[in-house]
Amino acid sequence: KFSKQSWGLENEALIVRCPRQGKPSYTVDWYYSQTNKSIPTQERNRVFASGQLLKFLPAAVADSGIYTCIVRSPTFNRTGYANVTIYKKQSDCNVPDYLMYSTVSGSEKNSKIYCPTIDLYNWTAPLEWFKNCQALQGSRYRAHKSFLVIDNVMTEDAGDYTCKFIHNENGANYSVTATRSFTVKDEQGFSLFPVIGAPAQNEIKEVEIGKNANLTCSACFGKGTQFLAAVLWQLNGTKITDFGEPRIQQEEGQNQSFSNGLACLDMVLRIADVKEEDLLLQYDCLALNLHGLRRHTVRLSRKNPIDHHS
């Protein structure tokens, strides 16, 4: 469960996250499992550890192997394993299966291809996109932040899409490429104004001080693949990332589910070690798509730990 496959190409940057998570204040030690040799943290090294991240700048085929990360806190240690494989660059245009990230699908009205793993890197626009080694050009293709949108998708748009970007580390630039398949579904979908299923409007959630708490923001957006649908949390009207409380984090990525045939998304807000001041905050679940934005507000209240339910 706490082992993760990662792969990359030689002479490209590769950044791997420890499969075990911890607070930013926890120290993370990395080791090369075969030799139990510690990975240095000095950035002058080609391979170095930076907290939860292991950086290969650039990667070499010889770097392949299993790496151990240990998240250390004052009260516990958690161990994870990163199985890293670095491949030689292909001379032809074919991307082998072992270099492919998960397949995504789209339909005539809705198509969005995320660039895999890009969130781990320090990249700046432009993000370049290729299909079968050809740079994508024309008004049908739009690069939005970390994803590609294809307008008026046709069956011919199915294929392997590669994103290419530059990772910057202390002024040095490294190339990164990632490829995933895109399939086109012929479906009669529709899109609705977002409907938030959870939390209930003005919900009061009972939490215990000192314990962890999870809040789930869940909304449905229509039938079929949804274009630019998202759910997220705000704290006192501020994005979680801007609020600056490391104990309170949004889950990475959004989980997609289907409820009665409707396409739904949910985002979990994790509050570690709930404190008194967390009860004073306002938690807003936002659901948005092309039609508009909806929000539901949650507040926390203290749960009496001696409450007994028959």
Partner: antibody, heavy 120, light 107 residues
Amino acid sequence: EVQLLESGGGLVQPGGSLRLSCAASGFTFSNSDMNWVRQAPGKGLEWVSFISSSSGYTYYADSVKGRFTISRDNSKNTLYLQMNSLRAEDTAVYYCARANNNWNFYFDYWGQGTLVTVSS
Amino acid sequence: DIQMTQSPSSLSASVGDRVTITCRASQSINNWLAWYQQKPGKAPKLLIYSASSLQSGVPSRFSGSGSGTDFTLTISSLQPEDFATYYCQQSYDTPITFGQGTKVEIK
């Protein structure tokens, strides 16, 4: 100092088109959600349109949906409003306004406005 | 759509008076409410956001309160420069809607 400067207003006939621009300076435009708000002569404020910082999301008031298009060019720090099929009831001062936070529709900075008159 | 209703539509007051303007939303908007001041020929100015947070640079005689559907803007001691029209606005969901405005005139 934050500045928003609208331009492109003027007199146009019903059914005509106009493109408004709003030049922004003094803040990180590419990180800011932006809006257009209008005010008919002697009337109250009416929100017209919204665009997210990355241009991914655009929202419109029902009264302009299908006729107006909001867009932005982050490399030029400029917000646009393309107005087609204009009607007499679109006559108003059009303001561009910055939202004070992503996904918060509180408008903390406004331009001075540009007057659009739709008349034959 | 959420309707915002302000009252009164206009009021006359003297310098030094305590002035209260109310705003009612057609459904609960929690505290997602802003107040703006607008003077003739000028752009609106943000006074209060999140129902009760004072925007930077706004004098402390302005205050906001309320949650849910009923909100109040209070000017504790009216100054000559406060004669203007005031608007409430909900930012709870789209479409964004404003109240019809309250004009504060000199008595």
